[in-house]
Protein backbone atom coordinates (compact mmCIF):
# COMPACT_ATOMS: atom_id res chain seq x y z
CA UNK A 1 0.00 0.00 0.00
CA UNK A 2 1.45 3.37 -0.94
CA UNK A 3 0.57 7.04 -1.18
CA UNK A 4 0.29 8.32 -4.74
CA UNK A 5 -0.37 11.99 -3.91
CA UNK A 6 0.82 13.25 -0.52
CA UNK A 7 -1.62 14.87 1.90
CA UNK A 8 -2.31 18.57 1.43
CA UNK A 9 -4.20 20.42 4.13
CA UNK A 10 -6.17 23.63 4.53
CA UNK A 11 -7.36 25.21 7.77
CA UNK A 12 -10.43 27.28 8.55
CA UNK A 13 -8.22 29.02 11.17
CA UNK A 14 -10.71 28.20 13.86
CA UNK A 15 -11.33 24.56 14.56
CA UNK A 16 -11.00 22.34 11.50
CA UNK A 17 -8.19 21.51 9.11
CA UNK A 18 -9.01 19.30 6.14
CA UNK A 19 -6.36 17.05 4.63
CA UNK A 20 -6.75 15.21 1.32
CA UNK A 21 -4.53 12.68 -0.41
CA UNK A 22 -4.60 9.92 -3.03
CA UNK A 23 -3.60 6.31 -2.61
CA UNK A 24 -1.92 4.08 -5.20
CA UNK A 25 -5.05 1.97 -5.62
CA UNK A 26 -8.62 1.52 -4.36
CA UNK A 27 -8.61 1.92 -0.57
CA UNK A 28 -11.18 1.72 2.19
CA UNK A 29 -9.82 4.82 3.90
CA UNK A 30 -11.74 4.53 7.18
CA UNK A 31 -10.92 0.84 7.64
CA UNK A 32 -7.31 0.82 6.52
CA UNK A 33 -5.82 4.22 7.35
CA UNK A 34 -5.31 6.57 10.28
CA UNK A 35 -3.89 10.11 10.22
CA UNK A 36 -2.20 11.01 13.51
CA UNK A 37 -1.61 14.67 14.24
CA UNK A 38 0.06 16.51 17.09
CA UNK A 39 0.59 20.18 17.85
CA UNK A 40 4.29 20.91 18.31
CA UNK A 41 3.85 22.47 21.76
CA UNK A 42 4.10 21.67 25.49
CA UNK A 43 3.18 18.00 25.96
CA UNK A 44 0.33 18.24 23.45
CA UNK A 45 -1.50 14.97 22.99
CA UNK A 46 -1.53 13.01 19.74
CA UNK A 47 -4.94 12.95 18.06
CA UNK A 48 -6.22 10.36 15.60
CA UNK A 49 -8.27 11.23 12.55
CA UNK A 50 -10.28 8.50 10.80
CA UNK A 51 -10.32 9.35 7.09
CA UNK A 52 -13.29 9.06 4.76
CA UNK A 53 -13.27 8.02 1.12
CA UNK A 54 -13.21 10.79 -1.44
CA UNK A 55 -13.54 8.94 -4.73
CA UNK A 56 -12.01 5.51 -5.40
CA UNK A 57 -8.41 6.27 -4.45
CA UNK A 58 -8.90 9.57 -2.58
CA UNK A 59 -9.10 10.04 1.18
CA UNK A 60 -10.09 13.06 3.25
CA UNK A 61 -9.63 13.70 6.97
CA UNK A 62 -11.02 16.47 9.17
CA UNK A 63 -8.58 17.39 11.93
CA UNK A 64 -10.24 18.99 14.95
CA UNK A 65 -8.43 21.77 16.78
CA UNK A 66 -9.44 23.76 19.85
CA UNK A 67 -7.81 26.98 18.76
CA UNK A 68 -5.14 28.29 16.42
CA UNK A 69 -2.30 30.77 16.81
CA UNK A 70 -0.28 31.94 13.86
CA UNK A 71 2.89 30.05 14.84
CA UNK A 72 1.17 26.67 15.17
CA UNK A 73 2.82 23.69 13.52
CA UNK A 74 1.44 20.15 13.46
CA UNK A 75 3.24 16.90 12.78
CA UNK A 76 1.24 14.51 10.59
CA UNK A 77 1.76 10.74 10.38
CA UNK A 78 -0.26 8.59 7.98
CA UNK A 79 -0.47 4.98 9.10
CA UNK A 80 -1.80 1.81 7.53
CA UNK A 81 -1.91 -0.51 10.53
CA UNK A 82 1.69 -0.71 11.78
CA UNK A 83 3.13 0.73 8.54
CA UNK A 84 4.06 4.41 8.39
CA UNK A 85 3.14 5.51 4.85
CA UNK A 86 3.98 9.19 5.08
CA UNK A 87 5.30 11.73 7.57
CA UNK A 88 4.92 15.48 7.19
CA UNK A 89 3.99 18.73 8.90
CA UNK A 90 1.36 21.41 8.50
CA UNK A 91 1.24 25.05 9.54
CA UNK A 92 -2.45 26.12 9.56
CA UNK A 93 -1.74 29.86 9.21
CA UNK A 94 0.04 29.25 5.90
CA UNK A 95 -2.83 27.31 4.35
CA UNK A 96 -6.04 29.08 5.28
CA UNK A 97 -9.36 28.64 3.55
CA UNK A 98 -11.91 30.75 5.44
CA UNK A 99 -15.30 29.49 6.45
CA UNK A 100 -18.12 30.49 4.11
CA UNK A 101 -20.23 33.49 5.19
CA UNK A 102 -23.75 32.62 6.34
CA UNK A 103 -27.26 34.01 6.63
CA UNK A 104 -27.25 35.86 3.32
CA UNK A 105 -30.41 37.99 3.28
CA UNK A 106 -31.80 40.35 0.68
CA UNK A 107 -33.76 43.41 1.84
CA UNK A 108 -35.86 45.10 -0.84
CA UNK A 109 -38.09 47.26 1.36
CA UNK A 110 -36.20 50.42 0.37
CA UNK A 111 -37.78 50.98 -3.05
CA UNK A 112 -34.73 51.97 -5.08
CA UNK A 113 -32.02 49.97 -3.27
CA UNK A 114 -31.29 46.29 -2.86
CA UNK A 115 -29.51 45.67 0.45
CA UNK A 116 -27.66 42.40 0.93
CA UNK A 117 -26.45 41.41 4.38
CA UNK A 118 -24.66 38.30 5.61
CA UNK A 119 -22.87 37.08 8.72
CA UNK A 120 -19.15 37.00 9.35
CA UNK A 121 -18.35 33.30 9.90
CA UNK A 122 -15.86 34.01 12.70
CA UNK A 123 -16.35 35.05 16.34
CA UNK A 124 -14.81 38.38 17.46
CA UNK A 125 -11.90 36.70 19.24
CA UNK A 126 -10.65 35.14 16.00
CA UNK A 127 -7.99 37.04 14.06
CA UNK A 128 -9.89 36.57 10.80
CA UNK A 129 -12.96 38.34 12.18
CA UNK A 130 -11.50 41.74 11.28
CA UNK A 131 -9.57 40.55 8.25
CA UNK A 132 -12.24 39.27 5.86
CA UNK A 133 -13.21 40.86 2.60
CA UNK A 134 -15.97 39.49 0.43
CA UNK A 135 -17.09 38.89 -3.13
CA UNK A 136 -20.81 38.95 -3.86
CA UNK A 137 -22.01 37.20 -7.00
CA UNK A 138 -25.41 38.31 -8.34
CA UNK A 139 -26.98 36.66 -11.36
CA UNK A 140 -30.17 36.64 -13.37
CA UNK A 141 -31.92 33.29 -13.03
CA UNK A 142 -33.14 33.40 -16.64
CA UNK A 143 -29.93 34.65 -18.24
CA UNK A 144 -26.66 33.32 -16.83
CA UNK A 145 -24.73 35.82 -18.96
CA UNK A 146 -26.30 38.53 -16.79
CA UNK A 147 -23.97 37.88 -13.85
CA UNK A 148 -21.74 40.23 -11.88
CA UNK A 149 -19.28 40.19 -8.99
CA UNK A 150 -19.17 42.98 -6.41
CA UNK A 151 -16.00 43.16 -4.30
CA UNK A 152 -16.68 44.25 -0.72
CA UNK A 153 -13.35 45.48 0.63
CA UNK A 154 -14.70 47.11 3.81
CA UNK A 155 -15.33 45.18 7.03
CA UNK A 156 -19.11 45.50 7.28
CA UNK A 157 -20.81 42.46 5.77
CA UNK A 158 -23.29 44.43 3.69
CA UNK A 159 -23.69 45.50 0.07
CA UNK A 160 -26.07 48.11 -1.32
CA UNK A 161 -26.83 48.20 -5.02
CA UNK A 162 -29.26 50.46 -6.89
CA UNK A 163 -32.27 48.40 -7.94
CA UNK A 164 -32.15 50.27 -11.25
CA UNK A 165 -28.93 48.43 -12.17
CA UNK A 166 -30.91 45.18 -12.25
CA UNK A 167 -33.56 44.24 -14.80
CA UNK A 168 -37.08 44.87 -13.66
CA UNK A 169 -39.51 41.99 -13.21
CA UNK A 170 -36.71 39.42 -13.03
CA UNK A 171 -35.73 36.91 -10.33
CA UNK A 172 -32.13 37.23 -9.19
CA UNK A 173 -29.91 35.10 -7.00
CA UNK A 174 -26.93 36.10 -4.88
CA UNK A 175 -24.17 34.28 -3.03
CA UNK A 176 -21.14 35.49 -1.13
CA UNK A 177 -17.65 34.19 -0.34
CA UNK A 178 -14.76 35.47 1.76
CA UNK A 179 -11.00 35.71 1.88
CA UNK A 180 -8.53 37.13 4.38
CA UNK A 181 -5.84 39.45 3.13
CA UNK A 182 -3.24 39.19 5.90
CA UNK A 183 -3.05 35.43 5.62
CA UNK A 184 -3.24 35.51 1.82
CA UNK A 185 -5.90 32.82 1.97
CA UNK A 186 -7.74 31.05 -0.78
CA UNK A 187 -11.39 31.99 -1.26
CA UNK A 188 -13.95 30.32 0.95
CA UNK A 189 -16.68 28.22 -0.55
CA UNK A 190 -19.71 30.18 -1.72
CA UNK A 191 -22.51 30.64 0.77
CA UNK A 192 -25.86 29.09 -0.10
CA UNK A 193 -27.57 31.37 -2.61
CA UNK A 194 -30.66 33.40 -1.88
CA UNK A 195 -33.33 34.50 -4.36
CA UNK A 196 -35.42 37.63 -4.76
CA UNK A 197 -37.66 39.26 -7.32
CA UNK A 198 -36.64 42.69 -8.58
CA UNK A 199 -39.93 44.58 -8.73
CA UNK A 200 -38.28 47.98 -9.14
CA UNK A 201 -39.90 50.22 -11.76
CA UNK A 202 -38.30 53.41 -13.04
CA UNK A 203 -40.21 56.59 -12.18
CA UNK A 204 -42.72 57.39 -14.96
CA UNK A 205 -40.96 60.55 -16.16
CA UNK A 206 -37.73 58.61 -16.77
CA UNK A 207 -39.35 56.02 -19.04
Amino acid sequence: MKVLQEPTCVSDYMSISTCEWKMGGPTNCSAELRLLYQLVFQSSETHTCVPENNGGVGCVCHLLMDDVVSMDNYTLDLWAGQQLLWKGSFKPSEHVKPRAPGNLTVHTNVSDTVLLTWSNPYPPDNYLYNDLTYAVNIWNENDLADSRIHNVTYLKPTLRIPASTLKSGISYRARVRAWAQHYNTTWSEWSPSTKWYNSYREPFEQR
Epitope: S15, F41, D66, D67, V69, S70, M71, D72, D125
Partner: antibody, heavy 116, light 112 residues
Protein backbone atom coordinates in the same frame (compact mmCIF):
# COMPACT_ATOMS: atom_id res chain seq x y z
CA UNK B 1 9.87 23.82 33.38
CA UNK B 2 7.17 26.25 32.29
CA UNK B 3 7.12 29.50 34.27
CA UNK B 4 5.63 32.98 33.99
CA UNK B 5 7.65 35.47 36.01
CA UNK B 6 5.88 38.77 36.68
CA UNK B 7 7.36 42.11 37.70
CA UNK B 8 7.29 43.18 41.36
CA UNK B 9 4.62 45.04 43.30
CA UNK B 10 4.05 48.68 42.42
CA UNK B 11 2.76 51.64 44.41
CA UNK B 12 1.53 54.37 42.07
CA UNK B 13 -0.18 57.74 42.34
CA UNK B 14 -3.75 58.31 41.11
CA UNK B 15 -3.78 59.49 37.49
CA UNK B 16 -0.41 57.88 36.73
CA UNK B 17 0.33 54.85 34.53
CA UNK B 18 2.06 51.56 35.23
CA UNK B 19 3.50 48.90 32.94
CA UNK B 20 3.54 45.31 34.17
CA UNK B 21 5.72 42.63 32.63
CA UNK B 22 5.44 38.86 32.37
CA UNK B 23 8.42 36.85 31.10
CA UNK B 24 7.90 33.27 30.01
CA UNK B 25 10.42 30.46 30.30
CA UNK B 26 10.05 26.86 29.18
CA UNK B 27 7.95 27.81 26.17
CA UNK B 28 7.73 30.38 23.40
CA UNK B 29 4.97 32.97 23.88
CA UNK B 30 4.46 32.96 20.09
CA UNK B 31 2.91 29.51 20.56
CA UNK B 32 0.14 30.76 22.84
CA UNK B 33 -2.25 33.57 23.58
CA UNK B 34 -1.16 35.70 26.53
CA UNK B 35 -3.98 36.94 28.79
CA UNK B 36 -4.23 39.24 31.78
CA UNK B 37 -6.64 38.71 34.66
CA UNK B 38 -7.48 41.22 37.40
CA UNK B 39 -8.18 40.27 41.02
CA UNK B 40 -9.20 42.99 43.44
CA UNK B 41 -8.47 42.44 47.16
CA UNK B 42 -10.74 39.75 48.59
CA UNK B 43 -12.66 39.58 45.32
CA UNK B 44 -13.05 37.36 42.28
CA UNK B 45 -11.29 37.13 38.95
CA UNK B 46 -11.92 39.43 35.99
CA UNK B 47 -10.67 38.82 32.46
CA UNK B 48 -8.93 41.94 31.08
CA UNK B 49 -7.82 40.95 27.59
CA UNK B 50 -5.38 38.97 25.51
CA UNK B 51 -2.77 39.17 22.76
CA UNK B 52 -1.53 36.89 20.01
CA UNK B 53 2.17 37.74 20.42
CA UNK B 54 3.06 36.84 16.83
CA UNK B 55 0.83 39.39 15.12
CA UNK B 56 0.03 41.71 18.04
CA UNK B 57 -3.72 41.14 17.66
CA UNK B 58 -5.40 42.16 20.91
CA UNK B 59 -8.89 41.90 22.28
CA UNK B 60 -10.17 43.44 25.53
CA UNK B 61 -13.17 43.25 27.80
CA UNK B 62 -15.11 46.45 27.08
CA UNK B 63 -14.62 47.82 30.61
CA UNK B 64 -10.82 47.70 30.13
CA UNK B 65 -10.82 49.26 26.65
CA UNK B 66 -8.81 52.48 26.99
CA UNK B 67 -7.64 51.46 30.47
CA UNK B 68 -5.37 48.53 29.56
CA UNK B 69 -2.95 48.15 26.66
CA UNK B 70 -1.46 44.70 26.14
CA UNK B 71 1.73 44.28 24.12
CA UNK B 72 4.34 41.58 23.63
CA UNK B 73 8.00 41.41 22.74
CA UNK B 74 8.71 38.02 21.21
CA UNK B 75 12.49 38.55 21.25
CA UNK B 76 12.48 38.68 25.06
CA UNK B 77 9.54 36.25 25.37
CA UNK B 78 7.69 38.85 27.44
CA UNK B 79 4.12 40.12 27.55
CA UNK B 80 3.25 43.53 28.98
CA UNK B 81 0.17 45.32 30.21
CA UNK B 82 0.07 49.08 30.65
CA UNK B 83 -2.66 50.54 32.85
CA UNK B 84 -3.36 54.25 32.46
CA UNK B 85 -5.20 57.00 34.38
CA UNK B 86 -5.07 54.91 37.54
CA UNK B 87 -7.72 55.20 40.26
CA UNK B 88 -8.29 53.36 43.52
CA UNK B 89 -10.51 50.92 41.60
CA UNK B 90 -7.42 49.71 39.76
CA UNK B 91 -5.80 48.53 43.01
CA UNK B 92 -5.56 44.78 42.44
CA UNK B 93 -3.37 41.80 41.76
CA UNK B 94 -2.88 41.34 38.02
CA UNK B 95 -2.12 37.85 36.76
CA UNK B 96 -0.64 37.05 33.38
CA UNK B 97 -1.78 33.69 32.03
CA UNK B 98 -0.95 31.70 28.94
CA UNK B 99 -3.90 30.02 27.26
CA UNK B 100 -3.47 27.12 24.92
CA UNK B 101 -6.35 26.55 24.84
CA UNK B 102 -7.03 26.79 28.59
CA UNK B 103 -5.35 28.69 31.41
CA UNK B 104 -2.75 26.07 32.29
CA UNK B 105 0.03 28.43 33.36
CA UNK B 106 -0.35 31.45 35.62
CA UNK B 107 2.17 34.04 36.75
CA UNK B 108 2.52 34.68 40.47
CA UNK B 109 0.60 37.96 40.13
CA UNK B 110 1.67 41.58 40.51
CA UNK B 111 0.06 43.76 43.18
CA UNK B 112 -0.63 47.28 41.97
CA UNK B 113 -1.62 49.71 44.72
CA UNK B 114 -2.99 53.10 43.72
CA UNK B 115 -2.63 55.59 46.53
CA UNK B 116 -1.78 59.25 47.03
CA UNK C 1 -21.53 39.82 28.49
CA UNK C 2 -22.18 36.30 29.73
CA UNK C 3 -22.81 36.19 33.46
CA UNK C 4 -21.48 33.11 35.26
CA UNK C 5 -23.39 32.51 38.50
CA UNK C 6 -21.90 30.13 41.06
CA UNK C 7 -23.74 28.57 43.98
CA UNK C 8 -23.25 28.29 46.85
CA UNK C 9 -21.06 31.25 47.79
CA UNK C 10 -19.63 29.29 50.70
CA UNK C 11 -19.59 25.52 51.13
CA UNK C 12 -18.74 24.08 54.56
CA UNK C 13 -17.92 20.36 54.23
CA UNK C 14 -16.57 17.57 56.38
CA UNK C 15 -13.34 15.89 55.31
CA UNK C 16 -14.14 12.74 53.33
CA UNK C 17 -17.61 14.01 52.36
CA UNK C 18 -18.76 14.89 48.84
CA UNK C 19 -18.94 18.50 47.69
CA UNK C 20 -20.86 19.87 44.75
CA UNK C 21 -20.57 23.35 43.20
CA UNK C 22 -22.97 24.66 40.58
CA UNK C 23 -22.23 27.16 37.81
CA UNK C 24 -24.93 28.61 35.56
CA UNK C 25 -24.27 30.77 32.49
CA UNK C 26 -26.72 33.48 31.42
CA UNK C 27 -26.67 32.08 27.86
CA UNK C 28 -25.31 29.08 26.01
CA UNK C 29 -21.53 28.81 26.09
CA UNK C 30 -21.18 26.52 23.11
CA UNK C 31 -18.45 28.03 20.90
CA UNK C 32 -19.10 28.41 17.19
CA UNK C 33 -16.71 25.49 16.64
CA UNK C 34 -19.07 23.25 18.62
CA UNK C 35 -16.94 22.96 21.76
CA UNK C 36 -17.93 24.17 25.21
CA UNK C 37 -15.02 25.95 26.89
CA UNK C 38 -16.17 25.68 30.48
CA UNK C 39 -13.34 25.38 32.97
CA UNK C 40 -12.90 25.08 36.73
CA UNK C 41 -10.04 26.65 38.70
CA UNK C 42 -9.00 26.36 42.34
CA UNK C 43 -7.27 29.24 44.09
CA UNK C 44 -5.66 28.41 47.40
CA UNK C 45 -4.81 31.22 49.87
CA UNK C 46 -1.81 33.26 48.71
CA UNK C 47 -1.52 31.38 45.40
CA UNK C 48 -2.51 31.90 41.79
CA UNK C 49 -5.45 29.87 40.50
CA UNK C 50 -4.79 26.37 39.13
CA UNK C 51 -6.66 24.58 36.37
CA UNK C 52 -8.71 21.56 37.43
CA UNK C 53 -11.18 20.84 34.61
CA UNK C 54 -11.37 21.97 30.98
CA UNK C 55 -14.06 21.55 28.33
CA UNK C 56 -16.67 20.69 30.99
CA UNK C 57 -15.48 17.19 31.87
CA UNK C 58 -11.74 16.81 31.21
CA UNK C 59 -9.37 16.64 34.16
CA UNK C 60 -6.12 18.53 33.67
CA UNK C 61 -2.91 16.51 34.09
CA UNK C 62 -2.05 15.84 37.73
CA UNK C 63 -5.57 16.58 38.99
CA UNK C 64 -6.84 13.76 41.26
CA UNK C 65 -9.76 11.70 39.97
CA UNK C 66 -11.92 12.72 42.92
CA UNK C 67 -12.60 15.89 40.89
CA UNK C 68 -15.18 15.57 38.13
CA UNK C 69 -17.05 18.02 35.93
CA UNK C 70 -20.39 17.65 34.22
CA UNK C 71 -23.13 19.66 32.52
CA UNK C 72 -24.12 21.15 29.18
CA UNK C 73 -25.77 24.21 27.68
CA UNK C 74 -25.99 26.62 30.60
CA UNK C 75 -25.77 24.35 33.67
CA UNK C 76 -22.50 22.93 34.95
CA UNK C 77 -21.33 21.16 38.10
CA UNK C 78 -18.02 20.43 39.78
CA UNK C 79 -18.04 17.47 42.16
CA UNK C 80 -15.37 16.47 44.67
CA UNK C 81 -16.11 12.90 45.73
CA UNK C 82 -14.11 12.83 48.98
CA UNK C 83 -12.91 16.21 50.20
CA UNK C 84 -9.35 16.38 51.50
CA UNK C 85 -7.71 19.20 53.46
CA UNK C 86 -5.67 20.25 50.38
CA UNK C 87 -8.90 20.92 48.44
CA UNK C 88 -9.77 23.96 50.54
CA UNK C 89 -9.81 27.28 48.76
CA UNK C 90 -11.96 29.21 46.29
CA UNK C 91 -13.32 27.49 43.19
CA UNK C 92 -14.08 29.50 40.06
CA UNK C 93 -15.88 28.46 36.91
CA UNK C 94 -14.89 30.20 33.69
CA UNK C 95 -16.25 30.41 30.17
CA UNK C 96 -13.78 30.84 27.32
CA UNK C 97 -16.28 30.43 24.50
CA UNK C 98 -17.46 34.01 23.98
CA UNK C 99 -15.63 37.33 24.33
CA UNK C 100 -15.47 38.85 26.85
CA UNK C 101 -14.45 35.70 28.70
CA UNK C 102 -15.95 35.61 32.18
CA UNK C 103 -15.39 33.98 35.57
CA UNK C 104 -17.99 32.97 38.11
CA UNK C 105 -17.97 34.81 41.44
CA UNK C 106 -16.28 31.95 43.27
CA UNK C 107 -17.27 29.35 45.86
CA UNK C 108 -15.28 29.09 49.08
CA UNK C 109 -14.82 25.50 50.22
CA UNK C 110 -14.17 25.35 53.95
CA UNK C 111 -14.09 22.75 56.69
CA UNK C 112 -17.28 22.28 58.67
Amino acid sequence: EVQLQQSGADLVRPGASVKLSCTASGFNIKDTYMHWVKQRPEQGLEWVGRIDPTNGYTIYASKFQGKATITADTSSNTAYMQLSSLTSGDTAVYHCVSRRPWFAYWGQGTLVTVSA
Amino acid sequence: DILMTQTPLSLPVSLGAQASISCRSSQSIVHSNGNTYLEWYLQKPGQSPKLLIYKVTNRFSGVPDRFSGSGSGTDFTLKISRVEAEDLGIYYCFQGSHVPYTFGGGTKLEIK
